[in-house]
């Protein structure tokens, strides 16, 4: 599998997206996990709803929600308020049994937020009554890992 | 309904080559999984591997790994079990299945099967 | 690879008769669990799937309980047709893999 690059902005959410073939994955419950180590197991975070009907449903754990669009086979991973310590290497997973087949090998890189290396005065800040509490903002940049790169560092 | 029709009958000698097919009804086929499993004379199942004719991704049984390869034709509905050269032991029994996974489960489950395929192998 | 073993390997039984057979798996395999029948010079038949799920078609005598290593699968009141071979197979891991067949004859 090669591994596709997710970029966020820290304290935004980011949006990832797992295509699949829905046919060859009917069925099948998903998941999202993060991997331990270049050769590590991969840590479940968060799966689809427990009755694969249902997967359109969105589940949380903490701030990672995970929904499957069965039909159009599009997996869903939605990291909320992104901070540094998300960024690693993830996997979307077709479970089947108690084995789980890799749909995309996922690179979450996260950004700094550029307003927070801005001075104060040249900040804009919302008045009373204006808020982002309605804002539903998510930055989302994908591309593929080119050829050599190495999504971990390397170990000795 | 649907439907596994497998090849006939086959008679080789050690060290000869062999395809035998599985063709399937409808236009269904590439949205399942196809098994093969063998069953010596008088023995038990055995799962040898799988393919999804959709895109040819295939698993094999680490006990059938080498020495048969499954593949598939989408266009003409017919998943293939082959070896390259035959030996004695593998006289047998070959059923094709499809393997259906049940929305509830997420596991999946031979729910039709073909006729059987016998080879027999003999100098 | 998961092992399964049935038991008994074969088993003497009348018309009318309830009758049981067990499969063991060597490590736990949730409920992903079939039965299968099989008739000589036959394919086999799905019966029981997910360790309790009748496939549709099959009458209701069958059933089948179990989760984790031990399973069961229970024929209520056996009938002329249900003689014949019954195997269980594991549906948790690859390779899958079966029972060595529990063999039901007419006593």
């Known amino acids: 599998h090669n591994t596709t690059v997710f970029q966020g902005v820290a304290g935004q959410s980011l949006q990832v997206s797992c295509p699949y073939d829905s046919m060859k994955h009917w069925g099948r419950r998903k998941a999202w996990c993060r991997q331990l180590g270049e050769k590590g197991p991969c840590q479940r975070v968060v799966s689809t709803h427990n009755l694969w009907l249902l997967s359109f449903l969105r589940r949380w754990n903490g701030s990672t929600a995970i929904t499957d669009d069965t039909l159009g086979g599009t997996l869903t991973i939605t990291l909320r308020n992104l901070q540094p310590h998300d960024a690693g290497l993830y996997q979307c997973q077709s479970l089947h049994g108690s084995e789980a087949d890799t749909l995309r090998k996922v690179l979450v890189e996260v950004l700094a937020d550029p307003l927070d290396h801005r001075d104060a005065g040249d900040l804009w800040f919302p008045g009373e009554s204006e808020s982002f509490e309605d804002a539903h903002v998510e930055h989302s940049i994908s591309r593929s890992l080119l050829e050599g790169e190495i999504p971990f560092p390397p170990t000795s | 309904e649907v439907q596994l029709v497998q090849s006939g009958a086959e008679v080789k000698k050690p060290g000869e080559s062999l395809k035998i097919s599985c063709k399937g009804s409808?236009?269904?086929?590439?949205?399942?999984?196809i098994a093969w499993v063998r069953q010596m004379p008088g023995k038990g199942l055995e799962w040898m591997g799988i393919i999804y004719p959709g895109d040819g991704d295939t698993r094999y049984s680490p006990s059938f790994q080498g020495q048969v390869t499954i593949s598939a034709d989408k266009s003409i509905s017919t998943a293939y079990l082959q070896w390259s050269s035959l030996k004695a032991s593998d006289t047998a029994m070959y059923f094709c299945a499809r393997s259906r996974t049940f929305y509830y489960d997420s596991s999946d489950y031979f729910d039709y099967w073909g006729q059987g395929t016998l080879v027999t192998v003999s100098s | 690879d998961i092992q399964m073993t049935q038991s008994p390997s074969s088993v003497s039984a009348s018309v009318g008769d309830r009758v049981t057979i067990t499969c063991r798996a060597s490590q736990g395999i949730s409920s992903w669990l079939a039965w299968y029948q099989q008739k000589p010079g036959k394919a086999p038949k799905l019966l029981i799937y997910?360790?309790?799920s009748r496939q549709n078609g099959v009458p209701s005598r069958f059933s089948g309980s179990g989760s984790g290593t031990d399973f069961t699968l229970t024929i209520s009141s056996l009938q002329p047709e249900d003689f014949a071979t019954y195997f269980c197979?594991?549906?948790?891991?690859?390779?899958?893999?079966f029972g060595q067949g529990t063999k039901l004859e007419i006593k």
């Open positions: 409808g236009s269904s086929f590439t949205s399942y999984w």
């Open positions: 997910a360790a309790s």
């Open positions: 197979q594991q549906a948790d891991r690859f390779p899958r893999t």
